[in-house]
């Protein structure tokens, strides 16, 4: 019986460890600055790193600019978006800006897109200052189903800060769906 | 066999409970206002509370102004930094401010420091208003190894809000590394 | 013995799954725009949705405008609050605004209320611009006891953005208390 108990314990340790790891998808995606769209309108950001520097992904998929859920669950989603402008880049078209981020969820089964979280600010970036900067952070807890896709839209993409510590988004699974 | 099963179940409950608690380090550190540096340049904040009010720590270490990781894992890191100024404190040097936070990771083995997250804003704090306030929040999911250290750098530390609900940072372990 | 092992494994799977779900309360509450108070003073927001759109709750209770903890534990708490104004709504009383959020904890046993997190900004919303927007995000890791209540206070509630992706708060349990 002792041997049997050891076997039970052993199999449980394996099972617990394996199921715990499998049950916890995550992603932290950082902006790919080589392919930031221009303009001041609202656009979807499709170029993100998933495997260099701080960027990483596990049990989720990054495809066509979207973070794809592979496992049903409740996830904490977050995004940090930084905008900046230096006078050496030339003058802005306008001193009044709307700097915004929208974290959206798309369901393939029912082709529809919905905004989960938004944040940002209107800003007056006066020509009297040589440098301007602004960051947005949003986060929230959402039920995600396998196949659903998370994407990021921003206004004024040409002003995005291309650093990996500045402009990123991510998700991690917290628990299963009952 | 029933007794044996009970023993297996019992030992498993203990093991599961114990390993779950051990596997989940966390910290929530609040600013120690008695020792905030002056100046408007970027400085590392080294004085934080870890055991009073909302501040707490478990399975991590706070030493020399840094939060030290004791256990490999993926952690959610966050920081909330508030800046404020009232005219009764005297006039500012300039009306333009860069109010920033940098969450950095230092590896002792390979002596290097890297910024994981940054946030903030340039602000125009006009002398026409008697009070000014601004808060930054950043958060993200990172792989941390035992011995690595997390620290906080800010610009304009003399403007920090010293309240425990205003200026703090923290971390909690979400999952093991595969 | 093989049958017994299967039974042990089976009961453990049930137990592990059940205890994991029971051990992880959460809530994501979105603003109920039909009942936002007026004025520019600091007020407690009592109308939130808990079961429509992105709003959801499990193993926590929403009552009298407060999120009630049913299970001791360490929780990650967060809030996202958006303010906005369009000139079509009429002029603001003042161009200088303090846009703030306070996440508070109330203990029934010891009738007291404490601010866990605060964030926001003073803003100059000039009449020269037809639209203004600003979002605040705060988050932190806190020990909560059964019966304690979380509530949200804001300044200038009449400026709140009523969208579910804009103004919300939430919590999820990360771990037990040792």
């Amino acid at each position: 019986i002792r041997a049997e108990k050891a076997m039970v314990d052993g199999s449980w340790l394996d099972l617990a460890k394996r199921s715990k790891l499998e049950a916890q998808p995550f992603a932290h995606l950082t902006i790919n600055a080589t392919d930031i769209p221009s303009g001041s309108h609202k656009v979807s950001l499709s170029s993100w790193y998933h495997d260099r520097g701080w960027a990483k992904i596990s049990n989720m998929t990054f495809s066509n600019g979207k973070l794809i859920v592979n496992q049903d669950g409740f996830y904490y989603l977050y995004a940090n978006i930084c905008f900046r402008h230096h006078e050496t880049s030339g003058d802005l078209a306008t001193e009044y800006l709307q700097l915004m981020v929208y974290v959206t969820k798309t369901s393939i089964k029912i082709p529809s897109s919905h905004t989960l979280m938004k944040g940002g600010s209107t800003k007056y970036w006066s020509g009297n200052s040589e440098f301007h900067f602004y960051s947005i952070n949003v986060g929230g807890f959402f039920k995600l189903r396998s196949g659903e896709e998370i994407s990021i839209e921003v206004s004024n993409p040409s002003l995005l800060d291309p650093d990996q510590d500045a402009t990123y988004f991510g998700a991690f699974k917290v628990r299963d769906i009952d | 066999i029933r007794a044996e099963k009970a023993m297996v179940d019992g030992s498993w409950l203990d093991l599961a409970k114990r390993s779950k608690l051990e596997a989940q380090p966390f910290a929530h550190l609040t600013i120690n206002a008695t020792d905030i540096p002056s100046g408007s340049h970027k400085v590392s904040l080294s004085s934080w509370y870890h055991d009073r009010g909302w501040a707490k720590i478990s399975n991590m270490t706070f030493s020399n102004g840094k939060l030290i990781v004791n256990q490999d894992g993926f952690y959610y890191l966050y920081a909330n930094i508030c800046f404020r100024h009232h005219e009764t404190s005297g006039d500012l040097a300039t009306e333009y401010l860069q109010l920033m936070v940098y969450v950095t990771k230092t590896s002792i083995k390979i002596p290097s420091s890297h910024t994981l997250m940054k946030g903030g804003s340039t602000k125009y704090w006009s002398g026409n208003s008697e009070f000014h306030f601004y808060s930054i929040n950043v958060g993200g999911f990172f792989k941390l190894r035992s011995g690595e250290e997390i620290s906080i750098e800010v610009s304009n530390p003399s403007l920090l809000d010293p309240d425990q609900d205003a200026t703090y940072f923290g971390a909690f372990k979400v999952r093991d590394i595969d | 013995i093989r049958a017994e092992k299967a039974m042990v494994d089976g009961s453990w799977l049930d137990l592990a799954k059940r205890s994991k779900l029971e051990a992880q309360p959460f809530a994501h509450l979105t603003i109920n725009a039909t009942d936002i108070p007026s004025g520019s003073h600091k007020v407690s927001l009592s109308s939130w949705y808990h079961d429509r759109g992105w709003a959801k709750i499990s193993n926590m209770t929403f009552s009298n405008g407060k999120l009630i903890v049913n299970q001791d534990g360490f929780y990650y708490l967060y809030a996202n609050i958006c303010f906005r104004h369009h000139e079509t709504s009429g002029d603001l009383a003042t161009e200088y605004l303090q846009l703030m959020v306070y996440v508070t904890k109330t203990s029934i046993k010891i009738p007291s209320s404490h601010t866990l997190m605060k964030g926001g900004s003073t803003k100059y919303w000039s009449g020269n611009s037809e639209f203004h927007f600003y979002s605040i995000n705060v988050g932190g890791f806190f020990k909560l006891r059964s019966g304690e209540e979380i509530s949200i206070e804001v300044s200038n509630p009449s400026l709140l953005d009523p969208d579910q992706d804009a103004t919300y708060f939430g919590a999820f349990k990360v771990r037990d208390i040792d």
Partner: nanobody
Framework: KVQLVESGGGLVQTGDSLRLSCAAS????????MGWFRQAPGKEREFVAV????????KYADRVKGRFTISRDNAKNMVYLQMNSLKPDDTAVYYC??????????????????WGQGTQVTVSS
């Protein structure tokens, strides 16, 4: 974007006075802290004085305290340095500089964004 031009330097005797002026153009400097630095031959550039954006707060290097006075006129986009009781070791090129951001005064050159070309002050014994 900001151009600074110093004037008022020259050759004077020990104990004399000089008034340096700094004219700013290209952008209003009324939101900036404005400072004076000096650099003697073979030495590092050193802080002399700084004035905050509205002229309500001043800071001086210890060696000029009580002898030099910094002032500004935001309407004219001008900054001044009144130098009294000059000594031979005040001899240097004097630079006007703009600190464009920050809650506290900068006393190191790195904290200043815009600089003038400098004006020579020579104090003979």
């Amino acid at each position: 974007k900001v151009q600074l031009v110093e004037s008022g330097g020259g050759l004077v005797q020990t104990g004399d006075s000089l008034r340096l002026s700094c004219a700013a153009s290209g952008r209003a400097i009324g939101s900036y802290a404005m400072g004076w630095f000096r650099q003697a031959p073979g030495k590092e550039r050193e802080f002399v004085a700084v004035i905050n954006y509205r002229g309500s707060s001043l800071k001086y290097a210890d060696r000029v305290k009580g002898r030099f006075t910094i002032s500004r006129d935001n309407a004219k986009n001008m900054v001044y340095l009144q130098m009294n009781s000059l000594k031979p070791d005040d001899t240097a090129v004097y630079y006007c500089a703009a600190q464009t951001s920050g809650a506290d005064f900068g006393t190191t050159p790195q904290r200043y964004t815009y600089w003038g070309q400098g004006t020579q002050v020579t104090v003979s014994s």
